[in-house]
């Protein structure tokens, strides 16, 4: 008896999080044995869609010509060869950007900080949101969210970063979002320069990248530390 | 065209089980998904099951859970509802219809066979 | 569990614009419960008409459309024909199973 299946791995071009109206592709690939592949996306009633492999056969691609909210979710594929289905792949999450607004993102007291100092960035959203996301560019794990307890909806969120040092400076968007879909958010806001002096510099960072793109693996994750965020909001690492 | 009849209907004791059938033409079985739903005699549509086009995945409603067994033979171009220990609240007018090939293709529910009746009485 | 809530009764006149709404006792309705509209007409005749809240079935005719509207779905007949008297359910899909709305009788005055 052979055993299971391996998994097929399963991505997106050119990334996975996508603006609103905006095309992408999602690939999974198999073995030269497949016959189909499926795409299931999380707690749909059937799956979501089907298709005939790519020649030479280990992979096929499932289009998405516009991006709407429909097809945020989280995603796994199977391929099916002449014993049966495979393992799923790991998930793929498919996000969507300009679901909502664009939050306002700023600093207080200044984007200007000296290092050791504190600072807070403040998203600010016109209606209210249940979920924050905060993101700097080319950070590993880009996503750190303020959620609000109790579904509680609120108009901003506070991240504080104590003390300040060189690796906190550079550049910030935020976005907002409603609980009942972590898949959808607002527009980004527009970028904040988070400057920080009175430490010796590294090197400069490359240019900045689309939060579609994959995040180098060169910087840690944000980590504000310090008070605990007002308005009931809750920090979640995801 | 697409057709579905249902079959194995009829009278039976409060406990005791019944096989309904609905078999299908005029389509490509073994590509869809397929739902049972029942009509309670003057009321609205209550969803029972759903199965998967290969069989994989199968959901039922609460209140038929654990006493029903949806299933399919591609083959025979047939899918089944098994119904053990029934109970008077299940008698119903009870139809199958069709899912989808997938979510992209397809809009669930748009076939219906005819009905077949199931009264439950002692 | 969840409730899925239509008006019970519709009256139109042909020619005339009418929608039928949709409400979950969960909250808004949103693209995840995929919202499909039935159309029961005598003798246990049931149609798809609408799936995925927008989705219309082959061979349905265009004055049918589905849509969200506030936190609910909605089928819109725009233009509504005499032979659009009917019994139309609503059924949306919660994580891993589906709930029928009762039904909306729509009576269309000839």
């Known amino acids: 008896q052979a055993g299971p299946l391996p998994k097929p791995t399963l991505w997106a071009e050119p990334g996975s999080v996508i603006s609103w109206g905006n095309s992408v592709t999602i690939w999974c690939q198999g073995t030269l044995e497949a016959r189909e592949y499926r795409l299931d996306k999380e707690e749909s009633p059937a799956p979501w869609d089907r298709q005939n492999p790519l020649e030479p056969k280990n992979k096929a691609r499932f289009s998405i010509p516009s991006m709407t909210e429909d097809y945020a979710g989280r995603y796994r594929c199977y391929y099916r060869s002449p014993v049966g289905w495979s393992q799923p792949s790991d998930p793929l999450e498919l996000v969507m950007t300009g679901a909502y607004s664009k939050p306002t993102l700023s600093a207080l007291p200044s984007p200007l900080v000296t290092s050791g100092k504190s600072v807070t960035l403040l998203c600010q959203s016109r209606s209210p949101m249940d979920t924050f996301l905060l993101i700097k560019e080319r950070a590993a794990h880009p996503l750190l969210h303020l959620r609000s307890e109790h579904g509680a909806q609120q108009h901003q969120a506070e991240f504080p970063m104590s003390p300040v040092t060189s690796v906190h400076g550079g550049t910030y968007r935020c976005f907002s979002s409603h609980g009942f879909s972590h898949y959808l958010l607002s527009h980004p806001s527009d970028p904040l320069e988070l400057i920080v002096s009175g430490s010796l510099e590294g090197p400069r960072p490359s240019p900045t990248r689309s939060v579609s793109t994959a995040a180098g693996p060169e910087d840690q994750p944000l980590m504000p530390t310090g008070s605990v965020p007002h308005s009931g909001l809750r920090r979640h690492w995801e | 065209q697409v057709q579905l009849v249902e079959s194995g209907g009829g009278v039976v004791q409060p406990g005791r089980s019944l096989r309904l059938s609905c078999a299908t033409s005029g389509f490509t079985f073994s590509s869809y998904g397929m739902h049972w739903v029942r009509q309670a005699p003057g009321k609205g549509l209550e969803w029972v099951a759903l199965i998967w086009f290969d069989g994989g995945n199968q959901y039922y409603a609460d209140s038929v859970k654990g006493r029903f067994t949806i299933s399919r033979d591609n083959s025979k171009n047939t899918l089944y509802l098994q119904l053990n220990s029934l109970r008077a609240e299940d008698t119903a007018v009870y139809f199958c219809?069709?899912?989808?090939?997938?979510?992209?293709?397809?809009?669930?529910?748009?076939?219906w066979g005819q009905g077949t009746l199931v009264t439950v009485s002692s | 569990d969840a409730v899925v809530t239509q008006e019970s009764a519709l009256t139109t006149s042909p020619g005339e614009t009418v929608t039928l709404t949709c409400r979950s006792s969960?909250?808004?309705?949103?693209?995840?419960?995929?919202a499909n509209w039935v159309q029961e007409k005598p003798d246990h005749l049931f149609t798809g008409l609408i799936g995925g809240i927008k989705n219309r079935v082959p061979g349905v005719p265009a004055r049918f459309s589905g849509s969200l509207i506030g936190d609910r779905a909605a089928l819109t007949i725009t233009g509504a024909q005499t032979e659009d008297e009917a019994i139309y359910f609503c059924?949306?899909?919660?994580?891993?199973?589906?709930?029928f709305g009762g039904g909306t009788k729509l009576t269309v005055l000839g």
């Open positions: 969960t909250g808004a309705v949103t693209t995840g419960n995929y």
């Open positions: 059924a949306l899909w919660y994580s891993n199973h589906w709930v």
């Open positions: 219809a069709r899912d989808v090939i997938s979510m992209v293709r397809g809009v669930p529910f748009d076939y």
